[in-house]
């Protein structure tokens, strides 16, 4: 995803940030309520701009106040630690007017063995050490503070987890004599909750746990945990979600099958399997209950652990999800692709809606991307023409009027969003690609005549011809 | 001022052995992952082997594995090449090169040392 | 392993104009928003030298003329306006998992 180079170069060490002692409670906050766009639909640049100028007229212009900056935190616990021993943290920006609470959890892949991890430290390190983590970070996408570019959450209060414990967000084994590292994705999530409630947290209302490939599978194993957390410390009223972003992976079998002897080319159950082991990995406690001992790794699985969440969680997912194709080793690098190739990507797409069939909150567009939610063009991607923000506050609507249990969605405000067309961008909204060689764009004719895509073959099943399927698609229709 | 300065290099003859050596300065030697480069002469870069900064993982390309063997001392700020079997395809310029940790990129080399394998 | 393909082997760019040098991957070395790609220019009897890292930063000290770009399999060194100090050897190279590897080399001359 875009605007991530934030890490320092080398040699330009920042002094450590303050640890600082939890804020003392503000006045309770006052809840901030949910817009409904249902009634400016057809007119959202001018609403959004009436509520931009009423939002900065009403908030205190102060400078500070006015910074899009997230600060950084080093955990005051320090024995909650990245890979190399170095504290973990979260990233901050304080929304003291409202009672909600989005907890982000960053991706980065995972590494499964001392080699792996070895080679991830020396030239990956923010991954795995917060030696060098920059004072502050700019929040995108869904954390962003702007409204033009976060109609869903604006006004929320924003945290960013670094990802340091290449784990999946699922360890709980500390740096000792036999552990050259550190795994403690599980625990840094309780601790960051556990700081945040001297924070304001405490005052919530609804708390978000989202999260980008690896953080999107972190939500799908930890959601539930946060959920009894807070409970147990005595904050029941907090109503915890997820939303898992990019994290939704499937057991399938490998284009081409390869040994398993780094991150990229292993076979997801094998690097989940060994990964689990490694670093004392930890899944939901009910999803655990329905595998065998050693059989944990399933529960790495969306479709898997999915049934067994109590909260509610909104899933989001391409339907030709690059890093899905990477561990399968597919390698789209600008050739024409060959046919058993292509059937192999349509059926994935396939798949992958068929795991979702049962997920009543997902957004799942037919395009070949990786992440989306904090992208600063997030708002841009439709199916079936509503937008992921849009149906997250359909989702929010539809929990607020308790309609968890029901399975009729709200009139005019859908939540289960999955694409139905069979092929890699045919929709034309989706996110745009760009030829591997050349650099220049691709409309979406090109780019599927460039997959090897026979037009004839992808007309039919739509009852036209290539020319009409042709004209239509370079007309982004 | 980051300094990295190779030694060891010569003539040997096919068959024979020799260990390249690599010193390092003004930096945190125990910090970086180090990397040695090859260039055979009138050709291209070739990477050919890669420590941990803790000295725990060591990689090797496919064309000289079995016959070198990498290590360092992290208390004498120096990598270490041992190379046996010595073959004329051997002969080159040996680099020894730093890696960003922040990327993997070659920040810094060596001016390098030349073995030559010849009877 | 990621084999990264150079092209042109060799190329002669007339002073003030722009050279072009593209470097393809045979799998993606892209991964959580940066790409493993870095450039080197190497002169006769000299050491390489890091010009460009993580496919578009500028390494410190190293003229603002040279600009990398692309993403995923497929990147570019651009030079412009070229100077006639850049006569050199250009290699592109990926860290994105081991093995480490380079691009065979372009040979820029200055016309």
């Known amino acids: 995803s875009e605007g991530r180079k934030t890490w320092r170069r080398r040699g330009q060490q920042p002094p450590p940030p303050p640890r600082t002692e939890a804020a003392p409670a503000a006045g309770q906050p006052v809840e901030s309520f949910p817009l409904d766009f249902t009634a400016v639909e057809g007119n959202m640049d001018s609403f959004m701009a009436q509520v931009k100028s009423l939002a900065q007229s009403l908030y205190p212009c102060s400078a500070q106040q006015l910074n899009e900056d997230l600060r950084l935190h080093l955990l005051l616990n320090t024995s909650v630690t990245c890979n190399d021993g170095s504290p973990a943290g979260y990233y901050l920006k304080e929304s003291r007017g409202s009672r909600r609470w989005l907890l982000f959890l960053e991706g980065g892949w995972y590494c499964f063995n001392r080699e792996n991890c070895d080679s991830r430290y020396d030239t990956m390190r923010r991954l795995m050490s917060s030696r060098d983590w920059p004072r502050t970070r700019t929040g995108t996408g869904i954390l962003s503070s702007q409204p033009e570019e976060n109609p869903y959450w604006w006004n929320a209060n924003m945290v960013f987890i670094p990802y340091c414990s290449s784990d999946v967000w699922s360890g709980a084994s500390s740096k000792s004599e036999k552990n050259e590292y550190a795994f403690m994705g599980a625990l840094i999530i309780q601790e960051v909750v556990r700081e945040l409630l001297g924070r304001g947290l405490s005052g919530a209302k609804v708390l978000l746990l989202a999260g980008s490939s690896a953080g999107g599978t972190g939500v799908l194993l930890n959601v539930d945990r946060v959920a009894e957390q807070l409970e147990k410390l005595g904050y029941p009223a907090i109503q915890v979600r997820g939303l898992a972003d990019s994290g939704w992976f499937l057991d399938n079998k490998q284009y081409r099958h390869t040994d398993c002897v780094d991150t990229i080319t292993c076979a997801p159950t094998e690097a989940i399997r060994r990964g689990i082991r490694y670093w004392n990995g930890v899944v939901p406690e009910r999803c655990r209950r329905q595998f065998q001992e050693g059989e944990e790794w399933n529960c790495f699985f969306g479709y898997k652990v999915y049934p067994t969440l109590r909260c509610p969680v909104f899933v989001v997912q391409w339907l030709f999800d690059e890093a899905q194709l990477t561990v399968d080793n597919v390698h789209l690098t600008g050739q024409p692709v060959q046919e058993g190739l292509r059937l192999y990507i349509q059926n994935l797409g396939r798949e992958l809606r068929h795991t979702l069939k049962d997920v009543p909150a997902s957004f799942a567009p037919a395009c070949l991307s990786h992440e989306i939610i904090i992208r600063s063009h997030w708002t841009d991607v439709q199916v079936k023409g509503t937008s992921l923000p849009r149906a997250l506050h359909c989702w929010d609507r539809s929990l607020h009027d308790s309609h968890k249990a029901s399975k009729t969605p709200l009139k005019g405000c859908p939540v289960h969003l999955v694409d139905s067309c069979p092929w890699p961008h045919c929709n034309p909204s989706c996110p745009t690609v760009r030829d591997q060689f050349t650099g220049q764009e691709m409309n979406v004719a090109q780019f599927l005549m460039h997959m090897g895509f026979d037009m004839q073959t992808v007309a039919q099943p739509q009852g036209l011809e290539p020319s009409e399927l042709l004209g239509m698609l370079s007309n982004g229709s | 001022d980051v300094q990295l300065l190779e030694s060891g290099g010569g003539l040997v003859q096919p068959g024979g052995s020799r260990k390249l050596s690599c010193a390092a300065s003004g930096f945190t030697f125990s910090d970086f992952g180090m990397h040695w480069v090859r260039q055979a002469p009138e050709k291209g870069l070739e990477w050919v082997a890669y420590?941990?900064?803790?000295?725990?993982?060591?990689y090797y390309a496919d064309t000289v594995k079995g016959r070198l063997t990498l290590s360092r001392d992290n208390s004498k700020n120096t990598l270490f090449l041992e190379m046996t079997s010595l073959r004329s395809e051997d002969t080159a310029m040996y680099y020894c090169a730093r890696a960003s940790y922040d990327g993997g990129y070659f920040d810094c080399w060596g001016q390098g040392t030349s073995l030559t394998v010849s009877s | 392993d990621i084999v990264l393909t150079q092209s042109p082997a060799s190329l002669a760019v007339s002073l003030g104009q722009r050279a072009t040098i593209s470097c393809r991957a045979s799998?993606?070395?892209?991964?959580?928003?940066?790409?493993?790609i870095h450039w080197y220019q190497q002169k006769p009897g000299q050491p390489p030298k890091l010009l460009i890292y993580?496919?578009?930063d500028l390494e410190s000290g190293v003229p603002a003329r040279f600009s990398g770009s692309g993403s995923g399999a497929a990147f570019t060194l651009n030079i412009h306006p070229v100077e006639e100090e850049d006569a050199a050897t250009y290699y592109c190279h990926h860290s994105r998992e081991l093995p480490f590897t380079f691009g065979s080399g372009t040979k820029l001359e200055i016309k």
């Open positions: 420590s941990s900064s803790g000295g725990t993982t060591v």
């Open positions: 993580l496919a578009s």
């Open positions: 799998k993606s070395v892209s991964t959580s928003g940066y790409s493993y």
